[in-house]
Each structure stands twice: as C-alpha cells, then as structure tokens.
C-alpha cells in the first residue's frame, strides 16, 4: 500500500543564465528508495542510484549537476528550460512516487520563487 507523499519545490522561477535547485522529498513511508530519476517532459536528465550513485545524461552533462542530496541543480538556464520537471522515486515495495515541479525561466532580473506544495 502506497502511503508516502512527495514534497517538491513546486512552481519556481529563475533568471536566464542563472541556476536553480530542483528538490523532492519523499516522506510518510517505510519503503526503501532504490533509485530516483529526474525527467524533463519525456527526457531523462539524471539518475541517482542507491548503489551506483549519479548518472547524468550525456546531452545534459554541461548544465546539470547532481545534488544537493537527491536533488538536481540546473545551470546556465535558458528560456527553453521552461517547463515541467519530474522526480520519480523507485521504492520497494511501494512502487513509484512522482513529484512535479514547474520551472519558468525569465528574461527579467526579477524571479520570484513559488511556495512549496505537496503531491500525494
């Protein structure tokens, strides 16, 4: 039975050329996390594996850094980075938990961070 919840950084905005940290946190479950996948729409950005550590997709190696923790840091942001990002937690025995973050990359120098929210 899936009892866990994923808390994410929610809707966030950042400046073009800057960087942003995408974070998810799984709570309220005793399940063991074996892997976390980070995806942008249908593209795999990175994998954090409990045994093998981090793997960054080759096409994102220059602009994606692992961490902090199970999070992901996006650097040298462009307007094309605007969109949905997903953290997918693979857990035993619960299965997968998915969190959603919407990132808006702004041309202006004012970028406000949205509030945190939970996805059950």
């Amino acid at each position: 039975m899936m009892t866990g919840t994923i808390e994410t950084t929610g809707n966030i905005s950042a400046e073009k050329g800057g960087s942003i940290i995408l974070q998810c946190h799984l709570s309220s479950t005793t399940a063991q996390v074996t892997q976390v996948n980070w995806e942008q729409q249908d593209q795999l950005l990175a994998i954090c594996n409990a045994d093998l550590g981090w793997h960054i997709s080759p096409s994102f190696k220059d602009r994606v850094a692992p961490g902090p923790g199970l999070g992901l840091t996006l650097q040298s942001l462009t307007v094309n980075d605007t969109g949905e990002y997903f953290c997918i937690y693979h857990t035993y025995p619960d299965g997968t938990y998915t969190g959603r973050i919407f990132l808006e990359v702004l041309e202006s120098s004012v970028a406000e961070h949205g509030a945190r929210f939970q996805i059950p």
Partner: antibody, heavy 122, light 106 residues
C-alpha cells in the same frame, strides 16, 4: 561475488527462541532491501516480510507479527531473524533474500541465502 | 493481498519436451512478476523478472510472457537439470508466491 551466507541449522524446544543470521558480501549491504521467506517441510514459499537496510525499519507480513523480529547490524553487513516462543509449526527452512534491481520493473529476489533449518521439537 | 494461482501443480514430462506453466494473479500486476526454480534441499534461483526478462546466466530455453493477470513460463526443450519445482512471484504490492509447479520425470 555477491552472496548471502546464513547460520547453521537449529534444534529448539517449544517455548525457546532462535536467532538466524544472514551475512551479505560482495555488494553494498545498505543499498538493497532484505526479505525473509519461510518454507515449511514439503510446502511452498511464504513471504514473511522485509527490512529496510537503510533505516533498519522492519515490515511484517500477516501472520508474522508478534513473535518475529527482523534486525540489522550494518557494521558487519548482517540481517537477523529472531523467533521467540517457538512452536512446532515454526519448523521450517528460513531464507533471507535480497531485492535486486534498481527500478520497480526490475525488482526480484536475485540473491538468496542457502537457508537455515529450524526444527522445533520436544 | 494479491493471490497467485499456478497450474498445473504437478507436471510429468520427458527430456526434450516443451513445458508451459501458467500463473494467474487475482488482480492486475502489470509486468511485476518473477519466476524461480527450486531443487530439493536448495534455495530458490531467480530465472525471470519483469515477466519476460531472463536473469543473467539463465539458459535461453527458459522464457516468460504475459502481463496483467495471466503469465506463462516456458521451457522450450526440457533438460535433465530442469526437473525441479517452479514458483511465480508478484512484486506489484507486498510480495506473494504462487503455490508451485513440480516438474517430474515421466
């Protein structure tokens, strides 16, 4: 190589306790969940539950609460099964089994201990 | 709990035979199914996971198929070392095993 080595056979009297050990080697112990499986003589496999090797948190299947305790000693990469107030019907082979695979569609019990026979008889 | 029903419970076959074992789940489990082989006095051995993926080192005469509620394990040409008991296992929720299929020499 990756392996799980269990402690030897035990002969116990009803009411006694037993502690079965399962020592892992050849991999990072805390990265893979550990399960316990019972097989009574001539019977099939019965999942007893599992323990989170990262947090030490145990989960017990129905019928295995109360007298059964899963624990860990991560410093020696070992999982334990303790059964108290033993009954004749606890006579069985007990296996530890690692969950292999990283993504959910790869999960399976890929490495098993050799099994520990626990016989309960007066 | 998700129940798994294996059929047949017993199967008599000869070396070289094609053998098929069926596993039915009481509810849909996608492809979260594994197959194990167990010989007397030995621990079970993983043959197939994710319904159809052959575990490393397992001979290619073993194959698995199915998704949802109905699954099959096929041994294309039975070998002397294949006489054993076979179990299916679901990992869609808390794991459960089927009752087993004993493959005996005819």
């Amino acid at each position: 190589q990756v392996q799980l080595v269990q402690s030897g056979s035990e002969l116990k009297k009803p009411g006694a306790s037993v502690k079965v050990s399962c020592k892992a080697s050849g991999y990072t112990f805390t990265s893979y969940p550990m399960n316990w499986v019972r097989q009574a003589p001539g019977q099939g496999l019965e999942w007893m539950g599992w323990i989170n090797t990262n947090t030490g948190n145990p989960t017990y299947a129905q019928g295995f609460t109360g007298r059964f305790v899963f624990s860990l000693d991560t410093s020696v990469s070992t999982a334990y099964l303790q059964i108290s107030s033993l009954k004749a019907e606890d006579t069985a082979v007990y296996y530890c089994a690692r969950v292999g695979g990283y993504s959910v569609d790869e999960y399976a019990f890929d490495v098993w201990g050799q099994g520990t026979l626990v016989t309960v008889s007066s | 709990d998700i129940q798994l029903t294996q059929s047949p419970s017993f199967l008599s076959a000869s070396v070289g035979d094609r053998v098929t074992i069926t596993c039915r789940a009481s509810q849909g489990i996608s492809s979260y199914l594994a197959w194990y082989q167990q010989k007397p006095g030995k621990a079970p051995k993983l043959l197939i996971y994710a319904a159809s993926t052959l575990q490393s080192g397992v001979p290619s005469r073993f194959s698995g198929s199915g998704s949802g509620t109905e699954f099959t394990l096929t041994i294309s040409s039975l070998q002397p070392e294949d006489f054993a008991t076979y179990y299916c296992q679901q990992l869609s929720s808390y794991p459960t095993f089927g009752g087993g299929t004993k493959v005996e020499i005819k």
